[in-house]
């Protein structure tokens, strides 16, 4: 049937698309860049990414229409809504703070929530994250222990414990929770670089033509014999 | 053999400063660890400043007690480290030790010590 | 910093008798733990690194235990030339610190 379907006959698909046979009578169009379309016969108006604040575009007729998202208006969703317009969106006396897309409520002493409408209480639930425990001090203040390795007022950091370190032989460190590592160098290994690598024992083979090897701090060595030298017993 | 052998101490008055040296010989300088540790008379070990190898780009580290008051600083070339000591107190007085860091968090190797007295 | 307790300060013995030091850390230190021996007018001299590994030319009476906080000293068998005072040192990060020192004297 290829000679009568409308792919040949009709070549349906305009500035330079593509036609692709689906059954006896239909058809899709595979479009050129910048061309929309069933039949690709619209230009692709939402090529210059008209469309702002991540909202969705579409081409309908060579004109281009876009979806804002929530928090966004305008033709091409270029304007903020303004919620703090709205009153009510902050309870208890809180203060709206318009932010792109959103808002927030800056809570007086005491509540607390996205529209302060909880009343706050210091270590419920625990503002201290990485296992530190939190102390009510007050009212509405609270402090937070910390674990070994961590600190600020939530313990929200890891204490680089790199600038103390230890790392021998030329390992480097690698900071960890209360403690740091050390990336060694291949002839060294160990948590801090101080055990030697037996080279003998790992490479069977690393003397040749009968050498022995012996093993040293940081490397090894060959005993060559019958007229054999190098480092390898090789030459 | 490793050696290491201090010098450059002596009396001097509160506020004043001095620079001890320590000259090692018998291993390849660059490849180690270097550190001061002190004892005053009749008292403990004190680490007092470390400088680490080449492949640590021979970052430096002090105590507490004496940052933004000494220095340690190495010659390659001399074989030789230094500790630069400036605003010294009475509490500084102390035999101070030039000590090789041998590559097992321990330290292998000592110098004979050399004194330093800070009196008016 | 990383707190060294050594214990005992001072401990009187004979020859031949055994001695046992210990070293409490503040924090873990992952055996990174030395001990040394220094006599009167002397610099301090390397026993044991790595808490238990004895250093070379030290003779197999001395020997060292523990890992975590927890680190011990031992002279099996007291020699008359083993009459000096012994300090632990931590070596996991700096600053370097050192406990207090403990006098073997004899008896």
């Known amino acids: 049937y290829s000679t009568s379907h409308p792919c040949f006959v009709s070549r349906p698909c305009l500035n330079g698309g593509t036609c692709h046979m689906l059954s006896r009578d239909t058809y899709e169009c595979t479009c050129q860049v910048g061309f929309t379309g069933k039949e690709c016969q619209w230009t692709d108006a939402c090529l210059s990414h008209p469309c702002a604040n991540g909202s969705t575009c579409t081409t309908v007729a060579n004109q281009f229409s876009c979806k804002c998202l929530t928090g966004f208006t305008g033709q091409k969703c270029e304007t903020d809504v303004n919620e703090c317009d709205i009153p009510g969106h902050c309870q208890h006396g809180g203060t709206c703070l318009n932010l792109p897309g959103s808002y927030q409520c800056q809570c007086p002493q005491g509540f607390t929530g996205q529209y302060c409408d909880s009343l706050y209480v210091p270590c419920a639930p625990s503002p201290c994250v990485n296992g530190g425990t939190c102390r009510q001090t007050g009212d509405f203040t609270f402090e937070c222990n910390c674990l070994p390795g961590f600190e600020g007022s939530t313990c929200e950091r890891n204490i680089d414990d790199c600038p103390n370190h230890r790392c021998q032989n030329g390992g480097v460190c690698v900071d960890g929770v209360n403690t740091y590592n050390c990336r060694c160098p291949p002839q060294w290994t160990g948590q801090f670089c101080t055990e030697d690598v037996d080279e003998c024992l790992l490479q069977p083979n690393a003397c040749q033509n009968g050498g022995t090897c012996a093993n040293r701090n940081g490397g090894y060595g060959c005993v060559c014999v019958n007229g054999w030298s190098g480092d390898d017993c090789s030459e | 053999e490793v050696q290491l052998v201090e010098s450059g101490g002596g009396l001097v008055q509160p506020g004043g400063s001095l620079k001890l040296s320590c000259a090692v010989s018998g291993f390849t300088f660059s490849d180690f660890y270097m550190e001061w540790v002190r004892q005053a008379s009749g008292k403990g070990l004190e680490w007092v400043a470390a400088q680490r190898n080449k492949a640590n780009d021979f970052s430096i580290v002090y105590s507490a007690s004496v940052k933004d008051r000494f220095t340690i600083s190495r010659d390659d070339s001399k074989s030789t480290l230094y500790l630069q000591m400036n605003s010294l107190k009475t509490e500084d007085t102390a035999v101070y030790y030039c000590s090789r860091d041998g590559g097992r968090l321990a330290l292998d190797a000592w110098g004979q010590g050399t004194l330093v007295t800070v009196s008016s | 910093d990383i707190q060294m307790t050594q214990s005992p300060s001072s401990v009187s013995a004979s020859v031949g008798d055994r001695v046992t030091i210990t070293c409490q850390t503040s924090e873990d230190i992952y055996s990174g733990l030395a001990w040394y021996q220094q006599k009167p007018g002397k610099s301090p001299k390397l026993l044991i690194y790595?808490?238990?590994r004895l250093q070379d030319g030290v003779p197999s009476r001395f020997s060292g235990s523990g890992s975590g906080t927890d680190y011990t000293l031992t002279i099996s068998s007291l020699q008359p030339e083993d009459f000096a005072t012994y300090y632990c040192?931590?070596?996991?990060?700096?600053?370097?610190?050192f406990g207090g020192g403990t006098k073997v004297e004899i008896k």
């Open positions: 790595g808490a238990s």
């Open positions: 040192q931590q070596g996991f990060k700096y600053p370097l610190t």
